[in-house]
């Protein structure tokens, strides 16, 4: 499986239950871990700071002690359990520590992790909310007129709205230069486009959509496959094909359809 | 303590300069301030401080203008980069220079980067469909205002168009939506007072021709190790190629 | 004073590439963009494309695509422009011309000299 | 591409006389800023074109009061007031609001 780098994770969880939010700052000698949380339209606020070497929360005033605890699986690593959660506990959690930078100066600048979006909900949702893939090859058109093709990924029926795409080329780690549309509600899921825009020469390459979710089946990321085309226009008949996905293999039928 | 960001949203062109505003009360004599960018990943990342007793900050692109009297500290972003597209914000730090002390934060004001003001550009519109879902990609168009119809008689539902700046500095745009009657479903296009039709780009060919995968090593006939379809694939006409993962 | 200089003549072989060039002087060259204009002997002017030397954001001529390729090296203020797979039908003047920015008028105030292509074997 | 139609192809005129040259595009050059881009050029003989006047009636400095422009839309004149022999050349429009750039095929002013 491929590993998109940084940004974008969730975690989903019911009423009255409890979550966990691990810190991804890898720094090393830090004193004090704060957690802050960003909720949409509001300014971040911090909620505690975590005494390192006296392995101590301090909470913000007015916040009800045992809602947060910072646990420390081992040396450098943090994570806040939220119990009891409430919907109003949904947001992005942040910790962040502060970088000297300069000894000189008594302090330089905060760091952040790329947060985690906590979503608290207790909506009856289908055992299966991981994003279901649709693909759209080039139309001939695009390909005949512009010597380019565009590639389009189409995400659906996925909870909760947390999601990172990217594309690549078979065999290679680069990550390529595509666009999106907005993440859409659909009933109580989502859903969400990607495409891919590549030039004429690389349209016999294979493409790979990855998908980072939540969901995905074993949490590992979701790899849809584009075939390769041939933009020479030719006749064929239809043939049942195989080609792997990051976790499953999967069939892939061609239909031939005349008019 | 508190900081206030009035400007919810501000949209600038690329090359040209944005302003962030951002006033603070405080009793503190000595303070710093900082800025900070969030990506639509949410990620958080340092840009530059402001010490109360600093002369003006400067760091790149970034500078900052700070009025102490007026407990104002506004950020300038020069040359503007369509990257610069995110969400800004103000926080005021404690005066203790502790490792204990706590970030103030603003609500945040959101920067659109925009297109550089140029000549219209008509688009080039096609139509991608696979089983029921059809997709109008409108491509390399400017200004931004358009109107993309997905002409069917049996409509399931469509959402609303995403629209992109695209790496050229223009425009694209993606219409979905879900038909009965794929197969017979066009895209017009109005634009810059002109209707563009996907049928405009058609390249007349035979009803049998496809754009065809290529034959690779990962293409090959079904043995028992392939599962089976995780969706039922439909026929399609346009791309002449309907897969569904 | 604002100027844009060109070489006066080139002569080169048909099927050949050729990089023309375009010293921009008297005003700051990453401030106004660079276009290049076609004029075939006795014909009219044909636009071929444009070049913003501050990021080097271009728009072309789909007539020209595939033909035409602008550059700027702003160390030397001087935009080019490459011509490739040249046959007598690239023979032509070629002018670069300056413009302000589209808010301004996008107006073509100085033109360099014009540099004569003669695509001959 | 927007077509830009000038006429007439050439025009013979006195020295002292008014000229008119027109300039007609297959669709309007009001952009969405507002601004509606049209310029026009002089190229005399053996030379490079010369900027006259932008956005259809802004006249560039330096060029002398005698030149004038106007129209919206589609419909764009060039007027001269009194023509004097430094006058003399190919005259072109040129629209700005949409790509592909596009020029008209150009008017000889010629004396008489």
């Known amino acids: 499986s491929s590993n998109l780098e940084g940004g974008t994770k969730s975690v989903t969880r019911p009423t009255r239950s409890s979550a966990e939010i691990t810190c991804d700052l890898t720094v090393i000698n830090a004193f004090y871990i704060h957690w802050y949380l960003h909720q949409e339209g509001k300014a971040p606020q911090r909620l505690l700071y975590y005494d390192v070497s006296n392995s101590k929360d301090v909470l913000e005033s007015g916040l009800s002690p045992g809602k947060y605890y910072t646990h420390t699986p081992r040396r450098w690593s943090w994570i806040l359990i939220l119990r009891n959660l409430i919907e109003n506990d949904s947001g992005v959690y942040y910790c962040a520590t502060w970088d000297r930078g300069n000894p000189k100066t008594h302090y330089y600048k905060k760091l952040f992790g790329s947060g985690t979006t906590l979503v608290v909900t207790d909506k009856q949702l289908d055992a299966d909310v991981s994003p279901k893939p649709t693909i759209f090859l080039p139309s001939i058109a695009e390909t005949k007129l512009q010597k380019a093709g565009t590639y389009l990924c189409l995400l659906e029926k996925f909870f909760p709205d947390v999601i990172k795409i990217h594309w690549q080329e078979k065999k290679s780690n680069t990550i390529l230069g595509s666009q999106e549309g907005n993440t859409m509600k659909t009933n109580d899921t989502y859903m969400k486009f990607s495409w891919l825009t590549v030039p004429e020469k690389s349209l016999d390459k294979e493409h790979r959509c990855i998908v980072r979710h939540e969901n995905n089946k074993n949490g590992v990321d979701q790899e849809i496959i584009f075939p390769p085309i041939k933009t020479d226009v030719i006749t064929m008949d239809p043939k049942d094909n195989c080609s792997k996905d990051a976790n499953d293999t999967l069939l892939l039928q061609l239909t031939n359809t005349s008019a | 303590q508190k900081v206030t960001q009035a400007q919810s949203s501000v949209s600038m062109p690329v090359r040209k300069a944005v302003t962030l505003n951002c006033l603070y009360e405080t009793s503190w004599w000595s303070y710093y301030i900082f800025w900070y960018k969030q990506l639509p990943s949410k990620e958080m990342i340092f840009l530059i401080r402001q010490g109360s007793d600093e002369q003006n900050a400067k760091s790149g692109r970034y500078s900052v203008n700070f009025k102490k009297a007026a407990k104002s500290v506004a950020l300038t972003i020069s040359a503007l980069q369509l990257e610069d597209s995110a969400k800004y914000f103000c926080a005021l730090g404690d005066p203790g220079g502790l490792n204990t002390d706590k970030l103030i934060f603003g609500k945040g004001t959101r920067v659109t980067v925009e297109p550089r003001s140029q000549p219209h550009t008509k688009p080039s519109v096609f139509v991608m469909k696979n089983g029921t879902n059809v997709a109008c990609l409108v491509k390399e168009f400017y200004p931004k205002d358009i109107r993309i119809n997905l002409v069917s008689s049996k409509k399931i539902t469509e959402f609303d168009p995403a629209i992109v700046i695209s790496p050229s500095g223009k425009y694209n745009a993606v219409k979905l939506g879900k038909y009965e009657d794929s197969n017979s479903v066009t895209c017009s296009v109005q634009h810059d007072n002109k209707t563009v039709h996907s049928t405009d780009f058609e390249v007349k060919t035979d009803s049998t021709d496809h754009v065809k995968p290529k034959e690779t090593e990962n293409t090959k006939q079904p043995s028992k190790s392939c599962h089976k379809p995780k969706a039922i694939v439909h026929t399609e006409k346009v791309n002449m190629m309907s897969l569904t993962v | 004073q604002v100027q844009l200089q060109q070489p006066g003549a080139d002569l080169v072989r048909p099927g050949t590439s050729v990089k023309l060039s375009c010293k921009a002087s008297?005003?700051?060259?990453?401030?106004?963009?660079m276009h290049w204009v076609q004029q075939r002997p006795g014909q009219g002017l044909e636009w071929i494309g444009v070049?913003?030397?501050?990021?080097?954001?271009?728009n072309y001529n789909q007539k020209f695509k595939g033909k035409a390729t602008l550059t700027v090296d702003t160390s030397s203020s001087t935009a080019y422009m490459q011509l490739s797979s040249l046959t007598s039908e690239d023979s032509a003047v070629y002018y670069c011309?300056?413009?302000?920015?589209?808010?301004?008028?996008?107006?073509?105030?100085?033109w360099g000299q014009g540099t004569t292509l003669t695509v001959s074997a | 591409d927007v077509v830009m139609t000038q006429t007439p192809l050439t025009l013979s005129v006195t020295v002292g006389q008014p000229a008119s040259i027109s300039c007609k595009s297959s669709?309007?050059?009001?952009?969405?800023?507002?601004?509606?881009?049209l310029n026009w050029l002089l190229q005399r003989p053996g030379q490079s074109p010369k900027l006259l006047i932008y956005?259809?009636?802004k006249v560039e400095s330096g060029v002398p009061d005698r030149f004038s422009g106007s129209g919206s839309g589609t419909d764009f004149t060039l007027k001269i007031s009194r023509v004097e022999a430094e006058d003399l050349g190919l005259y072109y429009c040129?629209?700005?609001?949409?790509?592909?750039?596009?020029f008209g095929a150009g008017t000889k002013l010629e004396l008489k």
């Open positions: 011309a300056r413009s302000d920015d589209y808010d301004e008028g996008y107006f073509f105030d100085q």
């Open positions: 008297g005003y700051t060259f990453t401030s106004y963009w």
């Open positions: 070049i913003d030397p501050s990021d080097s954001y271009t």
């Open positions: 669709q309007s050059l009001l952009h969405s800023n507002g601004k509606t881009y």
């Open positions: 956005l259809v009636s």
């Open positions: 040129l629209q700005v609001t949409h790509f592909p750039l596009t």
